[in-house]
């Protein structure tokens, strides 16, 4: 008889999860000569043992505190990058500007990106048909906990100049609902940062509005000055030439704004 | 601007005890988790130990679990961390550093640490 299964809103785990996180660790450590004493195996065991045999509406940060310390790892503060709703240019970008970082540039956000993962309580199956769906379930299931607990802490880390990358297409350009919009910018250490500078990303060809003056971004702006963190905005208009110019910034059109 | 200055490295025999001290400054220390951090010769970055700001709560790898200890003076706005049982495998240069991680830029020059009979 099949044994009765809890049916979630939301995508199962995905498929070959544990071979995925073990694959994606050993070829991080592999290109990144100062993780290389990382035991990927470990890093599985501490990842598995977040979730596995816990009700999947019921994880803590607590549950991932044995991973957050497998994972220690160098972050220049003042090189970091964070993204919303434009994942794919932040880490085009940190790709060439090969300084700067973006949390899935890092051990944690590297292993989880793109991933989906659950358990059952009481038992030591993964979830492959169904996980706890955000809103329609509960918010405190492994990949949001997870999330939410290595965001907080990337921006606890970052100092000086922190920078953002906002989608210009999107209705609400910063979401106060997004994980940028609901952790990282609440956790922005006041004493350690001393800018939030946002890049507004353009997404048609013939857009030449200030989305600077966007209200969403005058929001952002009222929430980090009240937290005594000075704001500032940048227009990138051309994202094509934008990423362009960070691979040639000599050539000689990059002197104009892009 | 945080600043940190770690001291009380030096040369020690298996079994032997140090006390390491990392005096901060630019920041409000007490507000802060604080942590010590190691790097082994030609090995990455290893967390050794977190304190929170008030000093209440503490956490370490199990690798130090038991002998070594951490705490903080937050009216001196320093950060300690006492190692008794030393092994040769402790060997590193030990770097203070703010918040719990595991994300840290340190900032200090670290103390060197050297267990050797």
């Known amino acids: 008889v099949p044994r009765w299964r809890q049916q979630w809103s939301g995508p199962g785990t995905t498929k070959r999860f544990p071979e995925t996180v073990l694959a994606r660790c050993v070829k991080y450590t592999e290109i990144h000569p100062e993780m290389r004493h990382v035991d990927c195996q470990s890093v599985w065991d501490a990842f598995k043992g977040a979730f596995i045999s816990k009700h999947p509406c019921n994880i803590t940060e607590e549950d991932y505190q044995p991973l957050m310390k497998l994972g220690t790892q160098t972050v220049p503060c003042n090189k970091i990058l964070l993204w919303s709703r434009i994942k794919d240019l932040a880490h085009q970008f940190t790709q060439v500007q090969r300084d700067m970082f973006t949390l899935e540039d890092t051990l944690l956000g590297y292993l989880a990106d793109d991933l989906t993962w659950c358990g059952e309580f009481n038992t030591s199956k993964i979830n492959y048909q169904s996980c706890p769906d955000w809103r329609k379930d509960c918010s405190n299931n492994p990949v949001s906990v997870f999330w939410k607990t290595v965001s907080r802490r990337f921006a606890e880390a970052a100092c000086d100049v922190v920078h953002v990358m906002l989608n210009g297409s999107r209705s609400k350009i910063f979401d106060k609902n997004s994980t940028f919009g609901s952790v990282e910018v609440h956790n922005l250490q006041p004493e350690k940062v001393q800018t939030l500078e946002a890049w507004v990303i353009h997404g048609g060809r013939e857009d030449s509005r200030d989305l600077c003056q966007d209200p969403t971004i005058k929001e952002l702006e009222s929430i980090i000055s009240k937290r005594n963190i000075q704001f500032s905005c940048k227009n990138i208009y051309r994202p094509d030439k934008f990423l362009q110019c960070v691979k040639n910034p000599e050539d000689s059109s990059c002197t104009s704004e892009i | 601007e945080v600043q940190v200055l770690e001291s009380g490295g030096g040369l020690v025999q298996p079994g032997g005890s140090l006390r390491l001290s990392c005096a901060a400054s630019?920041?409000?220390?007490?507000?802060?988790?604080m942590s010590w951090v190691r790097q082994a010769p030609g090995k990455g970055l290893e967390w050794v130990s977190t304190?929170?700001?008030?000093?209440?709560?503490?956490d370490y790898a199990d690798s130090v679990k038991g002998r070594f200890t951490i705490s903080r003076d937050n009216s001196k706005k320093t950060l300690y961390l006492q190692m008794n049982s030393l092994r040769v495998e402790d060997t590193a240069v030990y770097y203070c550093?703010?918040?719990?991680?595991?994300?840290?830029?340190?900032r200090g020059q670290g103390t060197l640490v050297t267990v050797s009979s």
């Open positions: 550093a703010d918040g719990r991680g595991p994300f840290f830029d340190y």
């Open positions: 630019g920041f409000t220390f007490s507000s802060y988790a």
């Open positions: 304190i929170s700001g008030s000093g209440d709560s503490t």
